[in-house]
């Protein structure tokens, strides 16, 4: 079941998943000057069974000059100062996470892909937060968020992370300076 909204935004932080649950959508977004092909899918889909999962559909981008499209009069800045959603990541993932049954690895990049990946997550998905370059993590608890179903509605737990303006970058799990293991840590809950 799809989560109704996106993971929480933490000032000066980005998030990513270590692996993606079946049913997750990754929008086929293209960089400036390129568009999704006319006969192309809206998104890639993590699909499969308990023993093997993979991404269905292929994202393809074509030059927007070759499409019957119109440029809007309210363009966005070429690059946002902070990315609130998942940046395009390297396909390499920690083996124990990406090999989970019913999960997909980070899909490899496609040609002329946008710099920012837009995922639609499913219930049970966990994402991990890190502070952006130039900010240091202050932890009051887990720097992660889980999409949960409560009383028939989906919600994301609140990550216990504050990023302060000191020149040190925290790491995602599995990288050089890993945070404490997520297992066994108390989870932040909000009353429903």
């Amino acid at each position: 079941e799809l989560c109704d909204d996106d993971p929480p935004e933490i000032p000066h932080a980005t998030f990513k998943a270590m692996a993606y649950k079946e049913g997750t959508m990754l929008n086929c977004e293209c960089k400036r000057g390129f568009r999704r092909i006319k006969s192309g899918s809206l998104y890639m889909l993590c699909t499969g069974n308990s023993s093997h999962s993979s991404w269905d559909n292929q994202c393809q981008c074509t030059s927007s000059a070759t499409r019957n499209t119109t440029k809007q009069v309210t363009p966005q800045p070429e690059e946002q100062k902070e990315r609130k959603t998942t940046e395009m990541q390297s396909p390499m993932q920690p083996v124990d996470q990406a090999s989970l049954p019913g999960h997909c690895r980070e899909p490899p990049p496609w040609e002329n892909e946008a710099t920012e990946r837009i995922y639609h997550f499913v219930v049970g998905q966990m994402v991990y937060y890190q502070c952006v370059q130039g900010y240091r993590a202050l932890h009051r608890g887990p720097a992660e968020s889980v999409c949960k179903m409560t009383h028939g509605k989906t919600r994301w737990t609140q990550p216990q992370l504050i990023c302060t303006g000191e020149m040190e970058t925290s790491q995602f799990p599995g990288e050089e300076k890993p945070q404490a293991s997520p297992e066994g840590r108390p989870e932040s809950e909000t009353s429903c």
């Epitope: 909204d5 809206l42 966005q76 837009i118």
Partner: antibody
Framework: QVQLQQSGAELVRPGTSVKMSCKAA????????IGWVKQRPGHGLEWIGD????????DYNEKFTGKATLTADTSSSTAYMQLSSLTSEDSAIYYC???????WGQGTLVTVSA | DTTVTQSQKFMSTSVGDRVSVTCKAS??????VAWYQQKPGQSPKALIY???YRYSGVPDRFTGSGSGTDFTLTISNVQSEDLAEYFC?????????FGGGTKLEIK
Amino acid sequence: QVQLQQSGAELVRPGTSVKMSCKAAGYTFTNYWIGWVKQRPGHGLEWIGDIHPGGGYIDYNEKFTGKATLTADTSSSTAYMQLSSLTSEDSAIYYCVSRNFAKWGQGTLVTVSA
Amino acid sequence: DTTVTQSQKFMSTSVGDRVSVTCKASQNVGTNVAWYQQKPGQSPKALIYSASYRYSGVPDRFTGSGSGTDFTLTISNVQSEDLAEYFCQQYNSYPYTFGGGTKLEIK
């Protein structure tokens, strides 16, 4: 919570234009396409086109090229659709949709009548 | 353009029954199909994406299946609140197209 709030019903004269709005809340407006769908009794649902507020790109169903004009204002997280040279065929409910068709607005009823 | 056909305009069923609504695409659309439920006076509500995946809050009595050109929405243990019109849609290629709808009537 993700919401798409559409403007109210319109009663308009043939040959004129109408502009309706769709205000998005609860998600990052510039990340997701916003599409428009027409519904007329006995004619089902028709996809008009969509706009990417972040990239500013628009795709139209060829059937609605020249009829519909899609715009978006990122500062107010609002998408707009203008319909021109209105005829009775344009009398319908118009929905805005987002997040890969998962979320639909409540619809705007347009009635074209002399 | 890809034409999407729902051959049955009306279907009649009873509470507790199982009913299948079908949808056919004029060309292969993979699994890029969604199903919507529209109750009288309301906007359509998304039920199924990618042919078989349920949206959150959709009861598990709603099941989608199919790929290629033939798709089915099955409602098991039909409830009175399932009285509605059901639309399928392909979003495999532009322009996205919808089926004509199937109205479910409860006996």
